[in-house]
């Protein structure tokens, strides 16, 4: 399986909400002994491997933000802890999973990583990640809504 990031760059005004998205692609084994663990964290560029450094998102670690279920089942994070920090991660039946960040500030700017771990009990774990950048802007040059840039091209889309 692979992880796709539909958008590689999100440019948002301060105070806006944004939903960062990843998508699980390829054949997904739905066997009894296969589980998918999905989570989010911040990272930084300039390392040996993108997303190898795991930093908290608004003081919540990747363990706090994880989703757990088998295959393409829907799931949500522990609501109370995440929502107190203006965060919510979710997953649907089609392999899409996301993290929503509310009331963005300049401090939220940076590189974000989604992580999917395929757990084959009795065998091994297989971890795959996707990366995207969030730029939070303020002032007269800031967009009125979030603008997203697809990973495959530099055409931008306005999202509200």
């Amino acid at each position: 399986f692979k992880v796709a990031t539909p958008y590689s760059l999100y440019v948002c005004p301060e105070g806006q909400n944004v939903t960062l998205t990843c998508r699980l692609l390829g054949p997904v084994d739905k066997g009894h002994d296969v589980t998918f663990y999905k989570t989010w964290y911040r990272s930084s560029r300039g390392e040996v491997q993108t997303c190898s450094e795991r930093r908290p998102i608004r003081n919540l670690t990747f363990a706090d933000l994880h989703l757990h279920h088998g295959g393409h089942q829907a799931a949500n994070t522990s609501h109370d802890l995440a929502q107190r920090h203006g965060l919510e991660s979710a997953s649907d039946h089609h392999g899409n999973f996301s993290i929503t960040m509310r009331n963005l500030t300049l401090l939220d700017s940076g590189l974000y990583c989604c992580l999917v771990v395929e757990i084959r009990h009795h065998h091994s774990e297989h971890a795959v990640h996707g990366a995207m950048e969030l730029q939070v802007q303020t002032g007269k040059d800031a967009p009125s809504n979030c603008v997203v840039y697809p990973s495959s091209s530099q055409d931008s889309e306005n999202i509200t």
């Epitope: 009894h32 663990y37 491997q49 190898s52 363990a63 771990v117 774990e125």
Partner: antibody, heavy 117, light 107 residues
């Protein structure tokens, strides 16, 4: 803050079954791996096995024929049973939370089990 | 199973000195390696995961490096509370295995 607490008899007779329980407090057991690890006196650490919240288990091949790990999510507990024990099974037994693609981030304080007649 | 060999078995140093601990794997574990600290009578404590990520609350004087088969835990300037036994652990394959440990003792 998640905390783990092991409980069970500190003395087991040879050939009998060692039974320990780990109680998870301050957080949900419905995620992560929940592992048992042991440490014989003055020696290193040995992973015994885990149970995933879904009920899937995975055991160290060196102990697999004697080990059973089970979970009771309603009580936020998981348990270890080790059958046909010998003096070589004397150790401090730890329960721990293991995060996928990460490490054992939270440990119980450990409980000493002596196998002796 | 993957065998982890730690060296040296014992490291005798003074407070303020730099400690360098080694862990070598019998086959590549990529960067799926963790380090733990254990003091007498206590449970191990996670220091580093994924070779170099510091666990929550771990001081910056602890750092990890390496990938593949050779890994290093460095304590930049030893504090009195750092004298303990340190274990490495791999998680690329089950069974999960630990190294034999390195004891860091006061010189």
């Amino acid at each position: 803050q998640v905390q783990l607490q092991e409980s069970g008899p500190g003395l087991v007779k040879p050939s009998e079954t060692l039974s320990l329980t780990c109680t998870v407090s301050g957080g949900s057991i419905s995620s992560y791996y929940w592992s048992w690890i042991r440490q014989p006196p003055g020696k290193g650490l040995e992973w015994i096995g885990y149970i995933y919240y879904s009920g899937s288990t995975n055991y160290n091949p060196s102990l697999k024929s004697r080990v059973t790990i089970s979970v009771d999510t309603s009580k936020s507990q998981f348990s270890l049973k080790l059958s046909s024990v010998t003096a070589a099974d004397t150790a401090v037994y730890y329960c721990a939370r293991d995060i996928p693609a990460s490490a054992f981030d939270i440990w119980g304080q450990g409980t000493m089990v002596i196998v002796s007649s | 199973e993957i065998v982890l060999t730690q060296s040296p078995a014992t490291l005798s140093l003074s407070p303020g000195e730099r400690a360098t601990l080694s862990c070598r794997a019998s086959q590549s574990v990529s960067y799926y390696l963790a380090w733990y600290q254990q003091k007498p009578g206590q449970a191990p404590r996670l220091l580093i995961y994924d070779a170099f990520n510091r666990a929550t609350g771990i001081p910056a004087r602890f750092s990890g490096s390496g990938s593949g088969t050779d890994f290093t835990l460095t304590i930049s300037s030893l504090e009195p509370e750092d004298f303990a036994v340190y274990y490495c652990q791999q998680r690329i394959n089950w069974p999960l295995t630990f190294g034999g440990g390195t004891k860091v003792e006061i010189k």
